[in-house]
């Protein structure tokens, strides 16, 4: 049957997520050759990032543990050109990359991207150094975009007896302190695979001790209120779950949130069918449950964050992770995360190498960017519950929140339903009483053009989404439905529905 009845639970919020629930990352590999960090000076990129504020910007990834801060390192020519062009002007308002520098970097980027992906696949990582200027570029990007920077420190700098050597971190802290930078911190990336990446085995207890040491450093500096997040472990398979448990026992007290990473697929082998498969989407549920089991058994009540996540690891799946098809995984992950109590979800990556970026190498927003922007504008922090009546629920996936009260079009008490249709026919959703006769605004996303689900362009309610200019995002125009309408959701599409004047007490 193509008409589907929904049930809502709106008595009280199941969870409260962060206003920065949907957050983003910049992979630390962008600093492998620090010249490419200058791309973050693009006004267009900042406009796009600003659209997702409030959010965290996590600078991290495998390269985290192969980057060394060198305060004496000279700026590159490109960095110098960039900073010189900003002299005597408001960098957030007028800052831009000198056109010749931008052109040069963009021409060289495809080669750099190949190099980074090759390094990743060969698992041969070399140390690189970054300068004060690199830190400045990164912080300026975050600050000008209204994002809160989380910086990943190198955890593979070790003494002979495998204690963490904090001296390089101290240099960076001192520099950031001197500049008055407000930064949160992480230590290490996917420590469960250090052995594979660097022939060094660090157990969870040792890592916990290292975090305690970093926490002490932070308390001694001007960063005494700085937040510390970790341990950024990978998926909770047996050894990783064990590592997380021993880490939390040893060092869990000093972290502000527990971070872990999740990918559905291997980017090299993923198929379009995988991206549309509810079995694949449901794998995430058991991963979340495992993490919560570990956290609740060691540090009950500690907040859990997805510190890095996307559709497929290894830079994403070519011709899939940057298309409309990727939105099914992304929206479902956001919905499940909120429903299961994850406070923040950090999308790998905002901009950078691979295919899972929100913004491409030309600084053009991809379908998942527009999906993220809509999510930001419409979805509030109070998480409620929607479900499909009957047994066939897995291909029609529905989530419910209070509406984002920062949206001037809506008011407290309104509801935002978001829904994913993986069926090959249109489904018609019927709202439960007393919402069935409310005015509903529809925000339907469909792919544009002949590539269908593999399109890199998207339409909102039939209108193509594109930037007005480098400084301006387009209006996100709702399509109001007649009160009492069923909510039509076409085959292989996803949509937000704002139920206006819902007057839900839990949302007020």
């Amino acid at each position: 049957q193509d008409v589907v009845d929904l049930d809502f639970f709106t008595q009280e919020p199941l969870h409260l997520v962060s206003p920065s629930f949907l957050s983003v990352t910049i992979d630390a590999n962008l600093a492998t050759d620090p010249r490419f960090l200058i791309l973050l000076g693009s006004p267009k990129l900042r406009t796009l990032a600003r659209g997702l504020s409030p959010a965290y910007l996590r600078f991290g990834g495998t390269k985290t543990d192969f980057l060394i801060f060198d305060p004496k390192k000279e700026s590159t020519f490109e960095e110098r050109s960039y900073w010189q062009s900003q002299v005597n002007q408001d960098i957030c308002k007028y800052g831009s990359i000198p056109p010749d520098v931008e052109e040069k970097l963009r021409l060289e980027w495809p080669y750099q991207e190949q190099l980074l992906l090759r390094e990743h696949y060969q698992k041969k990582f070399k140390n690189s150094t970054y300068s004060r200027s690199s830190v400045d570029v990164l912080y300026t990007f975050a600050n000008c975009s209204g994002l809160d920077l989380i910086f990943g420190l190198n955890a593979l700098l070790r003494t002979a007896d495998l204690q963490w050597n904090s001296s390089n971190a101290q240099l960076l802290l001192d520099y950031c302190s001197s500049k008055g930078y407000n930064i949160s911190w992480e230590l290490g990336n996917e420590p469960n695979s250090f052995l594979k990446k660097a022939d060094i085995f660090i157990n969870g207890s040792q890592l916990g001790e290292d975090f305690i040491q970093l926490h002490k450093l932070l308390r001694k500096s001007t960063f005494k209120n700085a937040k510390l997040y970790g341990p950024d472990v990978g998926q909770p398979r047996r050894k990783t779950a064990k590592m997380l448990k021993s880490f939390l026992k040893a060092g869990g007290e000093v972290i502000d949130s527990v971070t872990w990473h999740h990918y559905y697929l291997n980017g090299r082998t993923a198929t379009k069918e995988d991206f549309l498969n509810p079995d694949v989407l449901d794998i995430f549920i058991s991963s979340v449950q495992k993490v919560f089991q570990v956290v609740e058994s060691t540090r009950p009540g500690k907040k859990v964050w997805l510190g890095e996540t996307s559709s497929a690891y290894g830079g994403g799946a070519p011709l899939l992770s940057d298309t409309f098809a990727a939105g099914f995984m992304w929206l479902d992950k956001l919905g499940l995360s909120a429903r299961m109590g994850i406070e923040v979800v950090m999308r790998q990556v905002f901009f950078g190498a691979g295919n899972y970026h929100l913004v491409d190498e030309n600084f053009d927003p991809l379908p998942d960017y527009w999906l993220s922007l809509l999510f930001k504008k419409l979805v509030g922090t109070k998480v409620l519950m929607a479900s499909v009546q009957g047994s066939k629920r897995r291909k029609l996936r529905v989530y419910l929140h209070c509406t984002n009260t920062d949206n001037p079009r809506y008011k407290e008490g309104d509801l935002t339903l978001y829904a994913i249709n993986l069926h090959n026919v249109t489904k018609y959703l019927r709202l439960p009483y007393p919402f069935s006769n409310k005015q509903v605004d529809k925000y339907l996303l469909r792919p544009l053009g002949p590539h269908g689900l593999l399109s890199k362009s998207v339409q909102l309610n039939g209108l193509t989404l594109k930037m007005v200019d480098d400084q301006t995002l387009p209006p996100l125009m709702e399509k109001p439905l007649r009160p009492g309408s069923s909510l039509g959701l076409p085959a292989f599409s996803y949509s937000f529905f704002v139920i206006r004047n819902a007057k839900v007490a839990a949302c007020i």
Partner: antibody, heavy 122, light 111 residues
């Protein structure tokens, strides 16, 4: 094929009543919202009333509110318009029309009947 | 007086392009409710020509197109043909009236 056939029109005196019917075939009637639209001689189209696919909602134009009643019998695949207290200005061709998407999710009218003429005259 | 305002008539020579406007208010077209267009040939029932602002039902030639901006919508017909001579109506939903509303209709004459 998909078809709507109106009946019940005729000449009636002001203040009297008339009931129009619209027989549907060729589609799942119970899945579609249905409307009545009228057209006075030489004039434009005027929307009259709508009934949801399951009969749960009914709405009327101000000009007929309180006098006309829209109803449906899904078991008989038939739409009705009960017209009471008829006036001269109700003289028109009355069309029934189907919504363009099921379950009252669209207000475009993709299928129209041929119309039935109602003349209110003393 | 119709809620949606259309010009009473427009005309064009065969092969030309004509547009028919439909102006509403903030409670119908301006609220971004869907606009639909109908063609009514003499002595026949109306036929859906454009639905949802700019979508053509199957069988409608691509010479017909719809657009919308602000409180107005337009129907454009390119490559005008003799058989296009008919009355054209726009329709939308009006939230203040809780019902559908039509324009007064536009008679298209092919010269």
């Amino acid at each position: 094929q998909v078809q709507l056939v109106e009946s019940g029109g005729g000449v009636v005196q002001p203040g009297r009543s008339l009931r129009l019917s619209c027989a549907a075939s060729g589609f799942t009637f119970s899945s579609y919202g249905m409307h009545w639209v009228r057209q006075a001689p030489g004039k434009g189209l005027e929307w009259v009333a709508v009934i949801w696919y399951d009969g749960s909602n009914k709405y009327y134009a101000d000009s007929v509110k309180g006098r006309f009643t829209i109803s449906r019998d899904n078991s008989k695949n038939t739409l009705y318009l009960q017209m009471n207290s008829l006036r001269a200005e109700d003289t028109a061709v009355y069309y029934c029309a189907r919504e363009g998407a099921p379950y009252s999710s669209s207000d475009a009218f993709d299928i129209w009947g041929q119309g039935t003429m109602v003349t209110v005259s003393s | 007086q119709s809620v949606l305002t259309q010009p009473p008539s427009v005309s064009g020579a065969p092969g030309q392009r004509v547009t028919i406007s439909c102006t509403g208010s903030s409670s119908n077209i301006g609220a971004n409710y869907d606009v639909h267009w109908y063609q009514q040939l003499p002595g026949t029932a109306p036929k859906l020509l454009i639905y949802g602002d700019n979508n053509r039902p199957s069988g409608v030639p691509d010479r017909f197109s719809g657009s919308k901006s602000g409180t107005s919508a337009s129907l454009a017909i390119t490559g005008l043909q003799a058989e296009d001579e008919a009355d054209y109506y726009c329709q939308s939903y009006d939230s203040s009236l809780s019902g559908s509303v039509f324009g007064g209709g536009t008679k298209l004459t092919v010269l």
